[in-house]
Structure formats: structure tokens, C-alpha cells
């Protein structure tokens, strides 16, 4: 059976696959997924290994019309380095010489300057090029190689291994060499895979059942450390509770060097955040941290300094801490907007079972603002999801120059932020450089400010506007209001009407449904429309909603289904990547972010059209 990293190299023109007959004969044959001789896999960023021989595809020289055969894998050899060129060409790195079918006289696969159909290769059974099943480095644990990546294939006791092995062990623990010759270099580490006994790599907190892995012997950059955690279905450490910090202080007390944790300010326009999307509500900085020096965007925990945190350059090589298991954040359920009939007094705006009101003109210190909200039957607003924040920004009349109190504060316990309405902290969205908690003045209260409505801590004695929130009063079944300029069941935002398509549909079916409604799959023109759409669909239980964006017409170039320029994007991490497809908005923890899906997947969708009676603004000139 093919494992997910293995593939057959297929030439569509001949409908045949590459077949390693012997190390010196790499030819083609009728495709057979059970033939070991036809299985290949990437073993580094640029090397392709024959699974049958555990040898790598290479050439004797970078010249036209030489035979491609198999060689002992050598990550330094220029003659074994391959790269995908445009579309389905595979070429030797740095040259316009391609992996070619050969010809009637030449049965062997050849290196050739021609880029026609005989030089075009796909993964058998797919439309993808060979790089779509690229190499993913596997970071080792423990061992003696400072967490270096596995080197496949590697030699142990004169035998070659293309996967992690338990050779030499009686307990089933899986390991790999981190250089191609373990016998000479003696460098190895354990693989971040599940095997009997691998749970002893983790320390479980008996109180919370959360597990932590301390990799103090490793030396990785922040991004490498994060990847290593993710390879174990975990994330770099987040700390949201004082108990958790105490437990980790104990766990790391015998160590001296810094360890990467998930805290970072890598997002261009927002502040400190945890990589696992936990709220940044507990602060434990080392005195003098975070330093404002540019580039110091990643955070380490310092065992030698009472496990306090320090921001460093992300390329430094340190140990790291991974975390997995139940988080306490999921116990607080925010009702979906559609689940709750929301009735609000005049001048209050409804959303998901609550009513909201901005007090902009009567500026008050935080304490007085809180008192006013409570007198009105509510509290300073708490915000629990990106959808709720985006509702406030897009539909409450929030303005880019606003600076408004919200309910977050650390008045009760210093450096531990809580909502004044007592709801749990499940979400934070700090401005760049925030929370700063400047030492020379107590910044115990929090404001929303700037065009995106992100947050900053502030001295509580500043007179500012504020946002109140209260539970709505249900009054029997909700009356569906018809919004001016929109048909029944459509929701208005600025000049447009929007409707959720409730039938699970492919991209094409969704597009057709919208067209039948004299509308189109939604475009997204800017941050504010995105905010509206996030609040519109983000809390719904379905995972995806189609937008009108795809690269169906020109692979690699994303376009809307209507003739409109793509002026704004909101990609999820690792998107759009190399894969072609159609774009859908995520819900849940990644609410509103865009993912590329296969166009024939089924999802709900959002239709959009001009509201009636609206004058179309002129098209922007370029």
C-alpha cells in the first residue's frame, strides 16, 4: 500500500509510470500501485528517493541527454537536486534541463532540454505535480542531535532505513539517524510519532489533564519548534492561568536555558498572541520585557529566572515546550446568532442573544462607564469571538478614531485580565505592541481603538467613550424584519444585501443558486465587509461558506466570479499554497479566514447583490 508520502511518477502522454528496474536502469512501465519499483518519495526539499532501492534519482552531470539513474542519497550533491518548474515540469535545480521520457531508442528516463509533453509528469491518480506531495522535515526528540531533523534514508549497522525504526531496541521506540550515516556520525533522535511508551515523553498535569513536553536538549528556531509540536498534534505552550505557570515553573526548575513558548507578535497588525489561539490574558514578563527592539517577536520562558518570559529574535536556537490535551476554553459556548431571538431596546443593537450600545459622546473614566452600563441593565462589553468583535466594528457604528472602554481589566489580580461581567476570557485581540502594561503607570483597563478595533491596556482614569452590552430579553418567536432595500431573508450591510445559502452545494452549484436569485457568490472588498461577513456566518456550526473567489479560470490567479478586481485578501495560514481550487470562509476558531478547497466539495454559501434604491458609486480608476 502507498503511504501518504509515496507516489508514482506518471506521464500522461504515454500513460505510463517511472519504474526503477535496477539502480542503473530507471525506465517506464504500465502503472501499478503495488509495484515497489514504481514508488518514490521526497526525502529532502530537493531529493527524490526510490522506495524499492532506498537510493535517490540523480544524474552523472548537468548536461543534455544523460541518463537519470539511482545514486546513494547525498544531500550535498548538486546532481540529485530536483525542483518543480512551471506546471508539471521537473528539472534539475538551477538548470533548464528536465526529467524526460526518453524515446524509442532510449528506454531510460533522460535529462533533456525539451519541455514538451514528454517532460511533463504528475502524481499518478491526481492532477497534481510532484511537488504537491513535498517533503516535510521531521524534528527528533531526545537523542543526541539537539532535535535535528531525520535524514532519510540513513544507514544503521550497514542497513539502510527510509523510515523511523525500532532497530537495536526491544521496547518499540521509533528513532532515526539525523545524518545519512549513523554508523559513522552516531547522531540520532526519537521520532515524534505514536508508539508504545511515547506517552512518557509528556508530563500530565493531574489537575487539568493537560500534557506538556519539555524539549530542553533541542536547539531549534521558534518556527521549527512550533512545527515539531504540531507534528505531535500539539502546539507550542500557551499559559492562560496562574496555576499553569506554577506547574511549569516546577517542571522546569532544574533547567537553566531558555525554552520557546507559543507567545509571539508575528502578526503584522496585531499585538502579543499565543500560537494556539488561546487568549493572551495572563502576563509573566521578565522585568524589562517585552523589549521594543524590532525583530524580537518570539518569546522564551526562562527557567533560571523563575520561568518568566522574555522576547527574543525568532531565529535563535533554543529548547521548547509543547502542550496538548483539553483546554479549559471550550466549556464556554457562545450561542450562534441564528439560535437566539434577540430583542433590544431602542438605540441598542442585537447580536447573538445580546444587545450593544456605543456611548461615544459622554466620556467617562472606566469605573464610571462600568457604573453607567450596569445602571442600564448591562456591563461594559465582553468580547468572546472574532465574530463578536467584527459585529461591533461593522454594525455598531464604530469609527476608526474611536477609543472606547471595554470590560477587560486586571484590577483584581495584577497581570491577569478578566471581564467585568464575569464571563471567561476566551479571546483577545491586542493592538501591535500591546498589552504594554507600562511600569511607570498602572495600565489596568482596556480600550478598543484604531481602524480594526484591536485592544490596548490603558490607565483606568482616562475619560473615554465606552461600549455597553446586556442580555437581550426574548419575547416569543422572532419577527423577521425586512431590511430596507433587501428582500425577506436577506441581510443589509452598507450598499448590499446578503443571504446565506442553506443547501450544501459545490462551488458551481452555489454560484448557479446565487445567479438564480439575481445575485452572485459574495465578493469581499475590504476589511469592513470581511468583518460583517465574519459576524454573519462565523458562529454557525457549518465549517465552510463559499465565496465567489477561485482560480478555476487561470491556475494560480484567483478571481471573483463577477468582473471585480481582487483588492483585499484574508487567507488562513498556509493559504493559498500551491493547490488550485475555490475559496471558502472558515467558521469557528479561524472565523472568517479564507481556505482553498476542492471546488466539488459541498458547503453552504453567501450570495450578494446591490440593495434596491442604492446609487452605484463609480468604479475606481486605476
Amino acid at each position: 500500500l502507498l503511504d501518504t508520502r509515496q507516489f508514482l511518477i506518471y506521464n500522461e502522454d504515454h500513460k505510463r509510470c517511472v519504474d526503477a528496474v535496477s539502480p542503473s536502469a530507471v525506465q517506464t512501465a504500465a502503472c501499478n500501485q503495488d509495484a515497489e519499483s514504481q514508488k518514490f518519495r521526497w526525502v529532502s526539499e530537493s531529493q527524490i528517493m526510490s522506495v524499492a532501492f532506498k537510493l535517490c534519482l540523480g544524474v552523472p552531470s548537468k548536461t543534455d541527454w544523460v541518463a537519470i539513474t539511482l545514486y546513494a542519497c547525498d544531500s550535498k550533491s548538486e546532481f540529485q537536486k530536483w525542483e518543480c518548474k512551471n506546471d508539471t515540469l521537473l528539472g534539475i535545480k538551477g538548470e533548464d534541463l528536465f526529467f524526460n521520457y526518453g524515446n524509442r531508442q532510449e528506454k531510460n528516463i533522460m535529462l533533456y532540454k525539451g519541455s514538451g509533453l514528454w517532460s511533463r509528469w504528475k502524481i499518478y491518480g491526481t492532477t497534481d505535480n510532484l511537488c504537491s506531495r513535498g517533503y516535510e522535515a521531521m524534528y527528533t526528540l531526545l537523542g543526541n542531535a539537539n532535535g535535528a531533523t531525520c535524514a532519510f534514508p540513513f544507514k544503521f549497522e550497514n542497513k539502510w532505513y527510509a523510515d523511523c525504526t525500532s532497530a537495536g531496541r526491544s521496547d518499540g521506540w521509533l528513532w532515526c539517524g539525523t545524518t545519512t550515516d549513523y554508523d559513522t556520525d552516531k547522531l540520532f533522535g526519537y521520532c515524534p510519532l505514536k508508539f508504545e511508551g511515547s506517552e512518557s515523553l509528556w508530563n500530565k498535569d493531574p489537575l487539568t489533564s493537560v500534557s506538556y513536553q519539555i524539549n530542553s536538549k533541542s536547539a531549534l528556531t521558534w518556527h521549527q519548534a512550533r512545527k515539531s509540536c504540531q507534528q505531535q498534534n500539539a502546539e507550542l505552550l500557551s499559559i492562560t492561568e496562574i496555576h499553569e505557570q506554577t506547574y511549569l515553573t516546577g517542571l522546569t526548575s532544574s533547567l537553566t536555558s531558555g525554552l520557546w513558548i507559543g507567545l509571539n507578535s508575528l502578526s503584522f497588525n496585531s499585538g502579543w498572541q499565543w500560537s494556539d489561539r488561546s487568549p493572551f490574558r495572563y502576563l509573566n514578563w521578565l522585568p524589562g520585557s517585552p523589549s521594543a527592539e524590532p525583530g524580537k517577536s518570539c518569546v522564551s520562558l526562562n527557567p533560571g529566572k523563575n520561568a518568566k518570559w522574555e522576547n527574543l529574535e525568532c531565529v535563535q536556537k533554543l529548547g521548547y515546550i509543547c502542550k496538548k490535551g483539553n483546554t479549559t476554553l471550550n466549556s464556554f459556548v457562545i450561542p450562534s446568532e441564528s439560535d437566539v431571538p434577540t430583542h433590544c431596546p431602542s438605540q441598542w443593537w442585537p447580536y447573538a442573544g445580546h444587545c450593544y450600545k456605543i456611548h461615544r459622546d459622554e466620556k467617562k473614566i472606566q469605573r464610571d462607564a462600568l457604573t453607567t452600563c450596569r445602571k442600564e441593565g448591562g456591563d461594559l462589553t465582553s468580547i468572546h469571538t472574532i465574530e463578536e468583535l467584527d459585529f461591533i466594528i461593522s454594525q455598531l457604528g464604530y469609527e476608526p478614531n474611536d477609543e472606547l472602554w471595554i470590560g477587560l481589566n486586571d484590577i483584581k489580580i495584577q497581570m491577569y485580565f478578566e471581564w467585568s461581567d464575569g464571563t471567561p476570557v476566551t479571546f483577545t485581540k491586542w493592538l501591535r505592541g500591546e498589552p504594554s502594561h507600562e511600569n511607570n503607570r498602572q495600565e489596568d483597563c482596556v480600550v478598543m481603538k484604531g481602524k480594526d478595533g484591536y485592544w490596548a491596556d490603558r490607565g483606568c482614569e482616562w475619560p473615554l467613550g465606552y461600549i455597553c452590552k446586556m442580555k437581550s430579553r426574548s419575547q416569543g418567536p422572532e419577527i423577521v424584519e425586512v431590511e430596507k432595500g433587501c428582500r425577506k431573508g436577506w441581510k443589509k450591510h452598507h450598499f448590499y444585501c446578503y443571504m446565506i445559502g442553506h443547501t450544501l452545494s459545490t462551488f458551481a452549484e452555489a454560484n448557479q443558486t446565487c445567479n438564480n436569485e439575481n445575485a452572485y457568490l459574495t465578493t469581499i472588498e475590504d476589511r469592513y465587509e470581511q468583518a460583517f461577513l465574519t459576524s454573519f456566518v462565523g458562529l454557525r456550526p457549518e465549517k465552510y461558506f463559499w465565496t465567489g473567489l477561485s482560480d478555476i479560470q487561470t491556475k494560480g490567479t484567483f478571481q471573483w466570479t463577477i468582473e471585480e478586481e481582487v483588492r483585499f485578501t484574508h487567507w488562513n495560514s498556509d493559504m493559498p499554497g500551491r493547490k488550485p481550487g475555490c475559496v471558502a470562509m472558515r467558521t469557528g476558531i479561524a472565523g472568517g479566514l479564507w481556505d482553498v478547497l476542492k471546488c466539488d466539495e459541498k458547503a453552504k454559501f453567501v450570495c450578494k447583490h446591490w440593495a434596491e434604491g442604492v446609487t452605484h458609486p463609480p468604479k475606481p480608476t486605476t
Epitope: L142, G143, N144, F156, A167, G168, R169, S170, D171, W173, W175, Y182, K186, F188, Y190, G197, S200
Partner: nanobody, 119 residues
């Protein structure tokens, strides 16, 4: 690397008792299992008893009910309490540890301690 040091062997009369101990030291991350093996003159080495990190135990039929294996995780030490000893228990007793350490090899052996059961 990993060193195992056994102690507690000696001469004992039939029906008597002995307690063997084996301490592991070196660059050990974790010990997955520890056990006792024995080799009588002219015979193959055989497993006597083993204990996993979780505390599960296993005994050879010939010693069940007479020998007890136990472990002190904090000290990386394993013990073998031998009661009702018989002449056929005479052998060199070896300690084995299955460890996670700085080489990929897992099995480490002690030098052995001689147990003689004779009147």
C-alpha cells in the same frame, strides 16, 4: 553511557532468602523496563522476572510465588526478593534495563552477581 551495578548475591542455604538490587546510572531519560535473568553453568541465560515503568510484572513459572520483583523509579533501581530458595536457583543473576538514552540501543546489562544455594 548507561551502567548497571548488581549487588546482594552470595551463599545461602536451601529454604533461605536473598535480596538482589540493581542500580542504573548514566545519561538516562527514562527506563521502560527492568528485569532479572540468570545463567546456570552450562545452560542458556533465562528470564526470571521483569517489571515495566508502569509497574506490570512478569515471572518465569519456576519462580512464581517465591520471587518478587519491585522497583524504585526515583532511584532507578530494581530489586529481586528471593524466598524459599532451592539448589536449582544457583546461577549468575544478571540485571537488564531497557532504557531511553543517548544512543538508539535500548538494552543494557550488568556484570552479574553469583547466587549459590547449597547446604
Amino acid at each position: 553511557d548507561v551502567q548497571l551495578v548488581e549487588s546482594g548475591g552470595g551463599l545461602v542455604q536451601p529454604g533461605g532468602s536473598l535480596r538482589l538490587s540493581c542500580a542504573a546510572s548514566g545519561s538516562i531519560f527514562t527506563i521502560n523496563a527492568m528485569g532479572w535473568y540468570r545463567q546456570a553453568p552450562g545452560k542458556q541465560r533465562e528470564e526470571v522476572a521483569a517489571i515495566t515503568s508502569g509497574g506490570s510484572t512478569n515471572y518465569a513459572d519456576s519462580v512464581k510465588g517465591r520471587f518478587t520483583i519491585s522497583r524504585d523509579n526515583a532511584k532507578n533501581t530494581v530489586y529481586l526478593q528471593m524466598n524459599s530458595l532451592k539448589p536449582e536457583d544457583t546461577a549468575v543473576y544478571y540485571c537488564k534495563a531497557v532504557v531511553v538514552t543517548t544512543t538508539p540501543y535500548s538494552d543494557y546489562w550488568g556484570q552479574g552477581t553469583l547466587v549459590t544455594v547449597s547446604s
